[in-house]
Protein backbone atom coordinates (compact mmCIF):
# COMPACT_ATOMS: atom_id res chain seq x y z
CA UNK A 1 0.00 0.00 0.00
CA UNK A 2 1.32 3.41 -0.82
CA UNK A 3 1.64 5.56 2.26
CA UNK A 4 4.12 8.29 3.04
CA UNK A 5 7.31 6.32 3.66
CA UNK A 6 9.18 8.96 5.63
CA UNK A 7 6.74 9.17 8.53
CA UNK A 8 4.40 6.31 7.62
CA UNK A 9 1.02 8.00 7.50
CA UNK A 10 -2.05 7.66 5.29
CA UNK A 11 -2.64 10.89 3.32
CA UNK A 12 -6.20 9.97 2.38
CA UNK A 13 -7.42 8.66 5.73
CA UNK A 14 -6.45 9.95 9.14
CA UNK A 15 -8.60 7.30 10.84
CA UNK A 16 -5.87 4.71 10.46
CA UNK A 17 -2.93 3.31 12.37
CA UNK A 18 0.13 3.04 10.15
CA UNK A 19 3.26 1.04 10.85
CA UNK A 20 6.27 -0.12 8.82
CA UNK A 21 5.21 -3.75 9.05
CA UNK A 22 4.03 -4.23 5.49
CA UNK A 23 5.78 -6.48 2.97
CA UNK A 24 9.47 -5.64 2.82
CA UNK A 25 9.11 -3.23 5.73
CA UNK A 26 6.85 -0.92 3.75
CA UNK A 27 4.32 1.27 5.49
CA UNK A 28 1.00 -0.46 6.07
CA UNK A 29 -2.09 1.38 7.27
CA UNK A 30 -5.04 -0.31 8.93
CA UNK A 31 -8.42 1.32 9.38
CA UNK A 32 -9.42 1.88 12.99
CA UNK A 33 -12.25 -0.35 14.09
CA UNK A 34 -11.95 -2.98 11.38
CA UNK A 35 -8.20 -3.43 11.16
CA UNK A 36 -8.45 -3.80 7.40
CA UNK A 37 -5.44 -2.68 5.38
CA UNK A 38 -6.30 0.36 3.27
CA UNK A 39 -4.88 1.73 0.03
CA UNK A 40 -3.67 5.19 0.93
CA UNK A 41 -3.35 6.28 -2.70
CA UNK A 42 -7.13 6.57 -2.99
CA UNK A 43 -10.22 7.21 -0.88
CA UNK A 44 -11.13 4.68 1.80
CA UNK A 45 -14.57 3.15 1.48
CA UNK A 46 -17.42 4.77 3.39
CA UNK A 47 -18.10 1.51 5.24
CA UNK A 48 -14.61 1.35 6.72
CA UNK A 49 -14.74 5.06 7.55
CA UNK A 50 -18.04 4.66 9.41
CA UNK A 51 -16.66 1.67 11.28
CA UNK A 52 -13.58 3.66 12.23
CA UNK A 53 -15.73 6.56 13.34
CA UNK A 54 -17.76 4.27 15.57
CA UNK A 55 -14.63 2.84 17.16
CA UNK A 56 -13.84 6.32 18.47
CA UNK A 57 -17.35 7.72 18.88
CA UNK A 58 -17.96 11.44 18.80
CA UNK A 59 -21.29 13.22 19.10
CA UNK A 60 -23.82 11.78 16.70
CA UNK A 61 -24.57 14.20 13.91
CA UNK A 62 -27.89 15.89 13.40
CA UNK A 63 -30.41 13.86 11.45
CA UNK A 64 -31.57 15.25 8.13
CA UNK A 65 -35.19 15.49 7.03
CA UNK A 66 -36.41 12.47 5.09
CA UNK A 67 -37.46 12.86 1.48
CA UNK A 68 -40.23 11.09 -0.36
CA UNK A 69 -38.34 11.33 -3.64
CA UNK A 70 -35.11 9.63 -2.66
CA UNK A 71 -33.33 7.95 0.21
CA UNK A 72 -31.76 10.23 2.75
CA UNK A 73 -29.33 9.03 5.41
CA UNK A 74 -31.99 9.50 8.05
CA UNK A 75 -30.82 6.91 10.58
CA UNK A 76 -27.60 8.66 11.59
CA UNK A 77 -24.50 6.75 12.58
CA UNK A 78 -24.28 3.00 13.10
CA UNK A 79 -21.48 0.47 13.32
CA UNK A 80 -21.65 -1.26 9.92
CA UNK A 81 -20.59 -4.69 8.77
CA UNK A 82 -18.15 -4.38 5.87
CA UNK A 83 -17.16 -7.11 3.45
CA UNK A 84 -13.50 -8.06 2.86
CA UNK A 85 -13.27 -5.40 0.13
CA UNK A 86 -14.54 -2.76 2.53
CA UNK A 87 -18.01 -2.46 0.98
CA UNK A 88 -21.20 -2.46 3.02
CA UNK A 89 -22.74 -5.89 3.52
CA UNK A 90 -26.25 -5.87 2.08
CA UNK A 91 -27.75 -6.78 5.44
CA UNK A 92 -26.92 -4.79 8.54
CA UNK A 93 -27.97 -5.72 12.07
CA UNK A 94 -27.61 -4.00 15.41
CA UNK A 95 -26.76 -5.47 18.80
CA UNK A 96 -30.42 -6.26 19.48
CA UNK A 97 -30.79 -8.39 16.32
CA UNK A 98 -32.77 -5.77 14.45
CA UNK A 99 -31.78 -6.02 10.79
CA UNK A 100 -32.30 -3.99 7.60
CA UNK A 101 -31.02 -3.87 4.03
CA UNK A 102 -28.75 -1.09 2.83
CA UNK A 103 -27.57 0.24 -0.52
CA UNK A 104 -23.96 0.67 -1.60
CA UNK A 105 -23.63 3.88 0.43
CA UNK A 106 -24.91 2.18 3.57
CA UNK A 107 -28.28 3.92 3.70
CA UNK A 108 -31.26 1.83 4.82
CA UNK A 109 -33.56 0.88 1.93
CA UNK A 110 -36.05 -1.42 3.64
CA UNK A 111 -38.11 -1.49 6.79
CA UNK A 112 -36.34 -2.91 9.81
CA UNK A 113 -36.88 -6.59 10.53
CA UNK A 114 -35.34 -9.43 12.52
CA UNK A 115 -32.56 -11.90 11.80
CA UNK A 116 -34.76 -13.70 9.28
CA UNK A 117 -34.68 -10.65 6.98
CA UNK A 118 -33.01 -11.45 3.65
CA UNK A 119 -31.06 -8.96 1.58
CA UNK A 120 -30.18 -10.82 -1.58
CA UNK A 121 -27.78 -8.31 -3.09
CA UNK A 122 -26.08 -5.02 -2.38
CA UNK A 123 -28.10 -2.57 -4.47
CA UNK A 124 -25.99 0.10 -6.11
CA UNK A 125 -26.64 3.79 -5.53
CA UNK A 126 -26.12 5.12 -9.05
CA UNK A 127 -27.26 8.74 -8.61
CA UNK A 128 -26.37 11.07 -5.74
CA UNK A 129 -27.81 14.56 -5.47
CA UNK A 130 -25.87 16.84 -3.12
CA UNK A 131 -28.04 19.80 -2.20
CA UNK A 132 -26.15 22.73 -0.62
CA UNK A 133 -27.25 26.11 0.62
CA UNK A 134 -24.45 28.67 0.80
CA UNK A 135 -24.22 31.59 3.18
CA UNK A 136 -25.26 35.00 1.87
CA UNK A 137 -22.68 36.73 -0.30
CA UNK A 138 -22.48 40.18 -1.89
CA UNK A 139 -23.80 38.76 -5.12
CA UNK A 140 -24.51 35.45 -6.76
CA UNK A 141 -21.60 33.30 -7.89
CA UNK A 142 -20.99 33.03 -11.59
CA UNK A 143 -22.54 29.69 -12.55
CA UNK A 144 -19.75 28.57 -14.88
CA UNK A 145 -17.05 29.52 -12.38
CA UNK A 146 -18.89 27.63 -9.65
CA UNK A 147 -19.37 24.63 -11.95
CA UNK A 148 -15.67 24.59 -12.86
CA UNK A 149 -14.53 24.92 -9.24
CA UNK A 150 -16.73 22.09 -7.97
CA UNK A 151 -15.70 19.80 -10.82
CA UNK A 152 -12.05 20.60 -10.09
CA UNK A 153 -12.61 19.82 -6.41
CA UNK A 154 -14.11 16.39 -7.10
CA UNK A 155 -11.39 15.63 -9.63
CA UNK A 156 -8.37 16.78 -7.63
CA UNK A 157 -9.32 16.34 -3.99
CA UNK A 158 -11.49 13.25 -4.23
CA UNK A 159 -9.93 11.74 -7.38
CA UNK A 160 -13.37 11.23 -8.93
CA UNK A 161 -13.31 10.92 -12.71
CA UNK A 162 -14.94 14.02 -14.26
CA UNK A 163 -17.41 11.90 -16.23
CA UNK A 164 -19.14 10.99 -12.94
CA UNK A 165 -19.97 14.61 -12.12
CA UNK A 166 -23.12 14.76 -14.22
CA UNK A 167 -24.18 18.34 -13.51
CA UNK A 168 -23.84 21.35 -11.24
CA UNK A 169 -27.03 23.39 -10.84
CA UNK A 170 -27.19 26.82 -9.21
CA UNK A 171 -30.05 29.01 -8.13
CA UNK A 172 -28.78 31.29 -5.40
CA UNK A 173 -28.38 30.26 -2.61
CA UNK A 174 -28.92 26.62 -3.60
CA UNK A 175 -26.25 24.54 -5.31
CA UNK A 176 -26.95 21.01 -6.50
CA UNK A 177 -24.21 18.61 -7.50
CA UNK A 178 -25.31 15.50 -9.38
CA UNK A 179 -23.08 12.45 -9.30
CA UNK A 180 -23.97 9.52 -11.55
CA UNK A 181 -22.18 6.18 -11.79
CA UNK A 182 -23.83 2.99 -13.03
CA UNK A 183 -22.37 -0.41 -12.25
CA UNK A 184 -21.35 -0.80 -15.89
CA UNK A 185 -19.55 2.57 -15.91
CA UNK A 186 -17.40 1.98 -12.84
CA UNK A 187 -14.07 0.49 -13.84
CA UNK A 188 -11.46 -1.03 -11.54
CA UNK A 189 -9.63 1.73 -9.76
CA UNK A 190 -12.43 4.28 -10.17
CA UNK A 191 -13.41 6.13 -7.02
CA UNK A 192 -16.99 5.33 -6.02
CA UNK A 193 -19.40 8.26 -6.07
CA UNK A 194 -20.63 7.23 -2.62
CA UNK A 195 -17.14 7.48 -1.17
CA UNK A 196 -16.49 10.82 -2.87
CA UNK A 197 -19.80 12.19 -1.58
CA UNK A 198 -18.99 11.04 1.96
CA UNK A 199 -15.54 12.68 1.92
CA UNK A 200 -17.18 15.86 0.57
CA UNK A 201 -19.87 15.75 3.26
CA UNK A 202 -17.26 15.43 6.01
CA UNK A 203 -15.18 18.22 4.44
CA UNK A 204 -18.18 20.55 4.32
CA UNK A 205 -18.83 19.85 8.01
CA UNK A 206 -15.24 20.75 8.89
CA UNK A 207 -14.39 17.12 9.69
CA UNK A 208 -11.87 16.40 6.96
CA UNK A 209 -10.77 12.79 6.66
CA UNK A 210 -7.50 13.69 4.95
CA UNK A 211 -4.33 13.42 6.99
CA UNK A 212 -2.51 16.65 7.75
CA UNK A 213 -4.22 18.67 5.03
CA UNK A 214 -6.00 21.84 5.98
CA UNK A 215 -9.77 21.83 5.97
CA UNK A 216 -11.70 22.44 2.81
CA UNK A 217 -11.21 26.03 1.59
CA UNK A 218 -13.73 26.42 -1.22
CA UNK A 219 -13.35 29.61 -3.24
CA UNK A 220 -14.91 30.75 -6.47
CA UNK A 221 -12.82 33.47 -8.10
CA UNK A 222 -11.32 34.19 -4.69
CA UNK A 223 -14.71 34.52 -3.01
CA UNK A 224 -15.21 32.03 -0.12
CA UNK A 225 -18.02 29.55 -0.65
CA UNK A 226 -19.37 28.81 2.83
CA UNK A 227 -22.00 26.13 3.12
CA UNK A 228 -24.64 26.48 5.80
CA UNK A 229 -26.62 23.31 5.18
CA UNK A 230 -26.26 20.09 3.23
CA UNK A 231 -28.79 17.48 2.17
CA UNK A 232 -27.74 14.39 0.24
CA UNK A 233 -30.24 12.29 -1.68
CA UNK A 234 -29.44 8.77 -2.84
CA UNK A 235 -31.13 7.06 -5.80
CA UNK A 236 -30.66 3.32 -6.22
CA UNK A 237 -30.62 1.20 -9.37
CA UNK A 238 -33.50 -0.78 -7.84
CA UNK A 239 -36.14 1.26 -5.96
CA UNK A 240 -36.20 0.83 -2.17
CA UNK A 241 -38.78 -1.41 -0.49
CA UNK A 242 -40.56 0.42 2.31
CA UNK A 243 -44.02 -0.36 3.61
CA UNK A 244 -46.88 1.97 2.65
CA UNK A 245 -47.06 3.10 6.28
CA UNK A 246 -43.64 4.69 6.01
CA UNK A 247 -44.28 6.16 2.57
CA UNK A 248 -47.41 7.96 3.74
CA UNK A 249 -45.95 9.07 7.07
Amino acid sequence: HTAAQDNCTCPTNKMTVCSPDGPGGRCQCRALGSGMAVDCSTLTSKCLLLKARMSAPKNARTLVRPSEHALVDNDGLYDPDCDPEGRFKARQCNQTSVCWCVNSVGVRRTDKGDLSLRCDELVRTHHILIDLRHRPTAGAFNHSDLDAELRRLFRERYRLHPKFVAAVHYEQPTIQIELRQNTSQKAAGDVDIGDAAYYFERDIKGESLFQGRGGLDLRVRGEPLQVERTLIYYLDEIPPKFSMKRLTA
Epitope: S19, P20, D21, P23, G24, L32, S34, M36, D83, P84
Partner: antibody
Protein backbone atom coordinates in the same frame (compact mmCIF):
# COMPACT_ATOMS: atom_id res chain seq x y z
CA UNK B 1 18.43 -9.91 17.42
CA UNK B 2 14.72 -9.40 18.11
CA UNK B 3 13.69 -10.63 21.55
CA UNK B 4 10.47 -10.57 23.52
CA UNK B 5 10.96 -11.50 27.17
CA UNK B 6 7.90 -12.10 29.33
CA UNK B 7 7.41 -12.04 33.09
CA UNK B 8 7.28 -15.23 35.13
CA UNK B 9 4.45 -17.63 35.94
CA UNK B 10 1.59 -16.45 38.13
CA UNK B 11 -0.93 -18.21 40.38
CA UNK B 12 -4.10 -16.23 41.04
CA UNK B 13 -7.40 -16.72 42.81
CA UNK B 14 -10.73 -16.40 40.97
CA UNK B 15 -11.86 -12.78 40.81
CA UNK B 16 -8.31 -11.43 41.01
CA UNK B 17 -6.32 -9.67 38.27
CA UNK B 18 -3.04 -10.52 36.62
CA UNK B 19 -0.59 -8.24 34.82
CA UNK B 20 1.86 -9.86 32.42
CA UNK B 21 4.79 -7.89 30.98
CA UNK B 22 6.60 -8.27 27.68
CA UNK B 23 9.94 -6.49 27.22
CA UNK B 24 11.05 -5.95 23.63
CA UNK B 25 14.59 -5.49 22.35
CA UNK B 26 16.49 -5.64 19.07
CA UNK B 27 14.15 -3.39 17.07
CA UNK B 28 12.40 -0.02 17.18
CA UNK B 29 9.83 -0.70 19.88
CA UNK B 30 7.33 1.97 18.81
CA UNK B 31 7.16 0.83 15.18
CA UNK B 32 5.51 -2.57 15.46
CA UNK B 33 2.24 -3.91 16.83
CA UNK B 34 2.42 -6.18 19.86
CA UNK B 35 -0.29 -8.85 19.98
CA UNK B 36 -1.34 -11.00 22.89
CA UNK B 37 -2.33 -14.60 22.23
CA UNK B 38 -3.33 -17.17 24.81
CA UNK B 39 -3.44 -20.94 24.84
CA UNK B 40 -5.39 -22.95 27.39
CA UNK B 41 -3.97 -26.38 28.29
CA UNK B 42 -4.39 -28.75 25.35
CA UNK B 43 -6.27 -26.09 23.35
CA UNK B 44 -5.61 -23.92 20.33
CA UNK B 45 -4.42 -20.33 20.00
CA UNK B 46 -6.72 -17.42 20.80
CA UNK B 47 -5.99 -13.78 19.86
CA UNK B 48 -6.77 -11.39 22.71
CA UNK B 49 -5.90 -8.05 21.17
CA UNK B 50 -3.06 -5.77 20.22
CA UNK B 51 -1.42 -2.45 20.97
CA UNK B 52 0.53 -0.09 18.74
CA UNK B 53 3.26 1.28 21.04
CA UNK B 54 3.82 4.47 19.06
CA UNK B 55 0.46 5.94 20.09
CA UNK B 56 -0.97 3.33 22.49
CA UNK B 57 -3.84 2.51 20.11
CA UNK B 58 -5.42 -0.71 21.35
CA UNK B 59 -7.81 -3.15 19.78
CA UNK B 60 -9.37 -5.93 21.82
CA UNK B 61 -11.14 -9.14 20.96
CA UNK B 62 -14.81 -8.62 21.97
CA UNK B 63 -14.58 -11.72 24.14
CA UNK B 64 -12.13 -9.97 26.47
CA UNK B 65 -13.09 -6.34 25.90
CA UNK B 66 -14.50 -5.70 29.38
CA UNK B 67 -11.68 -7.49 31.22
CA UNK B 68 -8.45 -6.79 29.33
CA UNK B 69 -6.24 -3.70 29.31
CA UNK B 70 -3.07 -3.37 27.26
CA UNK B 71 -0.60 -0.62 28.01
CA UNK B 72 2.96 0.26 27.15
CA UNK B 73 5.98 2.00 28.65
CA UNK B 74 8.21 3.37 25.89
CA UNK B 75 11.00 4.23 28.34
CA UNK B 76 11.52 0.52 29.04
CA UNK B 77 10.19 -0.87 25.73
CA UNK B 78 7.68 -2.92 27.66
CA UNK B 79 4.08 -3.81 26.94
CA UNK B 80 1.67 -4.97 29.64
CA UNK B 81 -1.48 -7.06 29.44
CA UNK B 82 -3.78 -6.98 32.45
CA UNK B 83 -6.69 -9.40 32.70
CA UNK B 84 -9.22 -8.83 35.48
CA UNK B 85 -12.03 -10.85 37.10
CA UNK B 86 -10.10 -14.04 36.54
CA UNK B 87 -11.92 -17.37 36.35
CA UNK B 88 -10.64 -20.93 36.14
CA UNK B 89 -11.04 -20.99 32.34
CA UNK B 90 -8.45 -18.18 32.10
CA UNK B 91 -5.78 -20.68 33.09
CA UNK B 92 -3.52 -20.60 30.06
CA UNK B 93 -0.12 -19.71 28.66
CA UNK B 94 -0.16 -16.06 27.57
CA UNK B 95 2.14 -15.05 24.71
CA UNK B 96 3.12 -11.64 23.41
CA UNK B 97 4.05 -11.48 19.76
CA UNK B 98 5.40 -8.84 17.42
CA UNK B 99 3.48 -8.49 14.16
CA UNK B 100 5.39 -8.04 10.90
CA UNK B 101 4.13 -8.06 7.33
CA UNK B 102 1.31 -10.56 7.59
CA UNK B 103 2.18 -12.79 10.50
CA UNK B 104 3.36 -12.95 14.10
CA UNK B 105 7.08 -13.19 13.44
CA UNK B 106 8.49 -13.00 16.95
CA UNK B 107 7.09 -14.53 20.12
CA UNK B 108 7.79 -14.29 23.82
CA UNK B 109 8.53 -17.45 25.73
CA UNK B 110 5.03 -17.47 27.24
CA UNK B 111 3.73 -16.85 30.75
CA UNK B 112 1.68 -19.50 32.50
CA UNK B 113 -1.20 -18.02 34.48
CA UNK B 114 -2.97 -20.48 36.76
CA UNK B 115 -6.32 -19.51 38.27
CA UNK B 116 -7.20 -21.69 41.20
CA UNK B 117 -8.95 -21.30 44.52
CA UNK C 1 -15.47 -12.34 12.96
CA UNK C 2 -13.72 -14.45 10.35
CA UNK C 3 -13.81 -18.14 11.24
CA UNK C 4 -11.00 -20.42 10.09
CA UNK C 5 -11.68 -24.13 9.84
CA UNK C 6 -8.71 -26.49 9.59
CA UNK C 7 -8.83 -30.04 8.32
CA UNK C 8 -8.10 -32.72 9.08
CA UNK C 9 -7.86 -32.40 12.84
CA UNK C 10 -5.20 -35.11 12.85
CA UNK C 11 -2.95 -36.35 10.06
CA UNK C 12 -1.10 -39.64 10.60
CA UNK C 13 1.86 -39.96 8.25
CA UNK C 14 5.31 -41.48 8.05
CA UNK C 15 8.59 -39.61 7.61
CA UNK C 16 9.26 -38.94 3.93
CA UNK C 17 5.56 -38.68 3.08
CA UNK C 18 3.86 -35.56 1.78
CA UNK C 19 1.52 -33.67 4.15
CA UNK C 20 -1.33 -31.50 2.89
CA UNK C 21 -3.11 -29.35 5.46
CA UNK C 22 -6.22 -27.33 4.68
CA UNK C 23 -7.58 -24.08 6.08
CA UNK C 24 -10.92 -22.62 5.01
CA UNK C 25 -12.03 -19.06 5.83
CA UNK C 26 -15.67 -18.11 6.39
CA UNK C 27 -15.27 -15.21 3.95
CA UNK C 28 -12.88 -13.95 1.32
CA UNK C 29 -9.62 -12.82 2.94
CA UNK C 30 -7.47 -12.49 -0.17
CA UNK C 31 -4.03 -13.83 0.78
CA UNK C 32 -3.99 -12.54 4.36
CA UNK C 33 -3.18 -15.90 5.90
CA UNK C 34 -0.17 -17.15 7.85
CA UNK C 35 0.86 -20.62 8.93
CA UNK C 36 2.55 -21.60 12.21
CA UNK C 37 4.17 -24.70 13.64
CA UNK C 38 3.96 -25.41 17.36
CA UNK C 39 5.71 -28.10 19.32
CA UNK C 40 4.82 -29.04 22.93
CA UNK C 41 6.04 -26.50 25.45
CA UNK C 42 7.16 -24.05 22.77
CA UNK C 43 5.80 -20.84 21.30
CA UNK C 44 4.44 -21.04 17.75
CA UNK C 45 6.86 -20.46 14.87
CA UNK C 46 5.89 -18.54 11.72
CA UNK C 47 6.34 -20.64 8.57
CA UNK C 48 4.44 -18.86 5.78
CA UNK C 49 2.88 -15.42 5.36
CA UNK C 50 0.66 -13.89 2.66
CA UNK C 51 -0.57 -17.44 1.97
CA UNK C 52 2.49 -18.48 -0.01
CA UNK C 53 5.51 -16.38 0.95
CA UNK C 54 8.17 -18.31 2.81
CA UNK C 55 9.96 -16.97 5.88
CA UNK C 56 13.75 -16.85 5.93
CA UNK C 57 15.23 -19.72 7.89
CA UNK C 58 12.26 -22.00 7.25
CA UNK C 59 13.11 -25.14 5.24
CA UNK C 60 12.03 -25.14 1.58
CA UNK C 61 9.90 -28.25 2.10
CA UNK C 62 7.23 -25.97 3.64
CA UNK C 63 5.06 -24.21 1.08
CA UNK C 64 1.71 -22.48 1.07
CA UNK C 65 -0.92 -21.82 -1.57
CA UNK C 66 -4.44 -20.52 -2.02
CA UNK C 67 -6.38 -17.28 -1.95
CA UNK C 68 -9.87 -16.12 -1.15
CA UNK C 69 -11.29 -18.73 1.20
CA UNK C 70 -9.26 -21.90 0.62
CA UNK C 71 -5.64 -22.28 1.71
CA UNK C 72 -3.17 -25.14 1.85
CA UNK C 73 0.07 -25.79 3.68
CA UNK C 74 2.17 -28.50 2.10
CA UNK C 75 5.16 -30.26 3.61
CA UNK C 76 6.75 -31.98 0.63
CA UNK C 77 8.64 -34.67 2.55
CA UNK C 78 8.14 -35.02 6.29
CA UNK C 79 11.21 -34.93 8.50
CA UNK C 80 11.08 -36.31 12.07
CA UNK C 81 11.15 -32.76 13.48
CA UNK C 82 8.04 -31.77 11.48
CA UNK C 83 5.64 -33.74 13.65
CA UNK C 84 3.81 -31.00 15.50
CA UNK C 85 0.60 -28.97 15.49
CA UNK C 86 0.04 -26.49 12.65
CA UNK C 87 -2.20 -23.42 12.82
CA UNK C 88 -3.44 -21.02 10.18
CA UNK C 89 -4.19 -17.39 11.16
CA UNK C 90 -5.88 -14.55 9.29
CA UNK C 91 -4.79 -10.92 9.44
CA UNK C 92 -7.33 -9.54 6.97
CA UNK C 93 -9.22 -7.75 9.74
CA UNK C 94 -9.63 -7.54 13.49
CA UNK C 95 -10.20 -9.63 15.46
CA UNK C 96 -7.33 -11.71 14.11
CA UNK C 97 -8.33 -15.36 14.35
CA UNK C 98 -6.63 -18.75 14.33
CA UNK C 99 -7.80 -22.06 12.98
CA UNK C 100 -8.33 -24.93 15.42
CA UNK C 101 -5.08 -26.60 14.37
CA UNK C 102 -4.01 -29.78 12.61
CA UNK C 103 -1.87 -32.29 14.48
CA UNK C 104 0.62 -34.09 12.27
CA UNK C 105 1.57 -37.30 14.06
CA UNK C 106 3.82 -40.23 13.27
CA UNK C 107 1.96 -43.18 11.78
Amino acid sequence: EVQLVQSGAEVKKPGASVKVSCKASGYTFTSYWINWVRQAPGQGLEWMGNIYPSNSYTNYNQKFKDRVTMTRDTSTSTVYMELSSLRSEDTAVYYCSSYRSDGFAYWGQGTLVTVSS
Amino acid sequence: EIVLTQSPATLSLSPGERATLSCRASQNIGTSISWYQQKPGQAPRLLIEFASESISGIPARFSGSGSGTDFTLTISSLEPEDFAVYYCQQSNSWPFTFGGGTKVEIK
